[in-house]
Interface confidence: low
């Protein structure tokens, strides 16, 4: 995955010119409206806001910025189409317009800044590649199971935050908690096996972008489909079973019965 | 209509054994553990334990454990609470409950009476 | 083990009145917490549910707030039907206690 590049010049001109409002559009400035820090959609002729929310987090950063597309790529992607339309309809499109890019930093001058730094998190449901839902089956327990009208209010919201971890092109690290609780998957050994569990947190320290690599998933994206890596057991997966109602647990196998292939829903907040 | 019905009210001696019921219906029994919980006479609710229909996955309050069995027929929707030996300690009132994905018991038996006296 | 305190044991109060029910956890719960509201001779009713959300068919009158580990039930206005015995109930590492309960009594 490319470091995010310098700014350039002609970027700058873009440039809002307050260091805490880093936004630009694809059009030269106009009056923002929106964030982009949850996923939130803008008016069709908006654009995209990115804010940094302390002057803090500008220090040790390379000047850098990410793309940012003005609506108005969308309106022609989605040309014929309604004036209105729903965030899911939009969803489909993410990731032809957005691509995650990790953020690099020279240097930090202190470790904190890594603990306190804001989280970018967004809300989602999952399904596996038979469309199996994700519910909570009690507690700290997930099962897997084909769910249909009414009876898919029960599946599980993730808040999917990105972290600290080891990226690659094809890897991005992050946390799944479920959404308004303090709970996070996270796997441990138990008599000597890797497991997945759903582990409760102090909601005050959580989410962070340093969490503890028990918590961490190499979010894989492989023609269309996720997979989900614990990064604390390499090659083994977020799975689930062929047959209906049974847990989410963590597989050590690719390819075979097993189930280690999700599709993400986006979920407004 | 989504309900639980428990079975009637047991009297019983010391030292007896006892099976009491609760079915489901109206709703998908397997998909929703099932909780058991006591009130003595005049007292408060103690929550015994939990079952998933399902899988009979049980998990029983540390007060409980070895006091009481709970298990669960999912082929005719209905769990059960049972002791091998009664005590006269045992009287109660006992719910059934079910448990929903939002962390709260939200439809409840109507309860049991059990008394045991010699 | 989590233990629920209610406070307090009996509320007196007239209807119309307000009312403010306290459910304190000895460590946090989060938002895992639910009130139930239980008459004399009746299995109890659930009320509120992840702290702040009414359950199904449950009046306005009845909110719930708090997190961690002050929780608070409040009944904006006492009709003749509210009085009843009220519980607080969680859940932790498969432990589901409930409060002692309080008895709301007309005054």
């Known amino acids: 995955m490319a470091e995010v590049p310098e700014l350039a010049s002609e970027m700058m001109a873009y440039y809002s010119g307050n260091e805490d409002d880093l936004f630009f559009e694809a059009d030269g400035p106009k009056q923002m409206k929106c964030s982009f820090q949850d996923l939130d959609l803008c008016p069709l002729d908006g654009g995209i806001q990115l804010r940094i929310s302390d002057h803090h987090y500008s220090k040790g950063f390379r000047q850098a910025a990410s793309v940012v597309v003005a609506m108005d790529k969308l309106r022609k992607m989605l040309v014929p189409c309604p004036q209105t339309f729903q965030e899911n309809d939009l969803s489909t499109f993410f990731p032809f317009i957005f691509e995650e890019e990790p953020i690099f930093f020279d240097t930090w001058d202190n470790e904190a800044y890594v603990h306190d730094a804001p989280v970018r998190s967004l809300n989602c449901t999952l399904r596996d590649s038979q469309q199996k839902s994700l519910v909570m089956s009690g507690p700290y327990e997930l099962k897997a199971l084909h769910l249909q009208g009414q009876d898919m209010e029960q599946q599980v919201v993730f808040s999917m935050s990105f972290v600290q971890g080891e990226e690659s092109n094809d890897k991005i690290p992050v946390a799944l908690g479920l959404k308004e609780k303090n709970l996070y998957l996270s796997c441990v050994l138990k008599d000597d096996k890797p497991t997945l569990q759903l582990e409760s947190v102090d909601p005050k320290n959580y989410p962070k972008k340093k969490m503890e690599k028990r918590f961490v998933f190499n979010k894989i994206e492989i023609n269309n489909k996720l997979e989900f890596e614990s990064a604390q057991f390499p090659n083994w997966y977020i799975s689930t079973s062929q047959a209906e109602n049974m847990p989410v647990f963590l597989g050590g196998t690719k390819g075979g019965q097993d189930i280690t292939d999700f599709t993400m829903q986006f979920v407004s907040s | 209509e989504v309900q639980l019905v428990q079975s009637g009210a047991e009297v019983k001696k010391p030292g007896e054994s006892l099976k009491i019921s609760c079915k489901g219906s109206?709703?998908?029994?397997?998909?929703?553990?099932i909780g058991w919980v006591r009130q003595m006479p005049g007292k408060g609710l103690e929550w015994m334990g939990i079952?998933?229909?399902?899988?009979?996955?049980?998990r029983y309050s540390p007060s409980f454990q070895g006091q009481v069995t709970i298990s669960a027929d999912k082929s005719i929707s209905t769990a059960y609470l049972q002791w091998s030996s009664l005590k006269a300690s045992d009287t109660a009132m006992y719910y059934c409950?079910?448990?929903?994905?939002?962390?709260?018991?939200?439809?409840w038996g109507q309860g049991t009476m059990v008394t045991v006296s010699s | 083990e989590i233990v629920l305190t209610q406070s307090p044991a009996t509320l007196s109060l007239s209807p119309g009145e307000r009312a403010t029910l306290s459910c304190r956890a000895s460590?946090?719960?989060?938002?895992?917490l639910a009130w139930y509201q239980q008459k004399p001779g009746q299995a109890p009713r659930l009320l509120i549910y992840?702290?702040?959300n009414r359950a199904t068919g449950i009046p306005a009158r009845f909110s719930g707030s708090g997190s961690g580990t002050d929780f608070t039930l409040t009944i904006s206005s006492l009709e003749p039907e509210d009085f009843a015995v009220y519980y607080c109930?969680?859940?932790?590492?498969?432990?589901?206690?409930f409060g002692q309960g309080t008895k709301l009594e007309i005054k």
């Open positions: 409950a079910r448990y929903t994905n939002w962390d709260a018991f939200d439809i």
């Open positions: 109206g709703y998908s029994f397997t998909s929703y553990w």
């Open positions: 079952i998933y229909p399902s899988d009979s996955d049980t």
């Open positions: 460590q946090s719960v989060s938002s895992y």
């Open positions: 992840d702290a702040s």
């Open positions: 109930q969680q859940r932790s590492n498969w432990m589901f206690p």
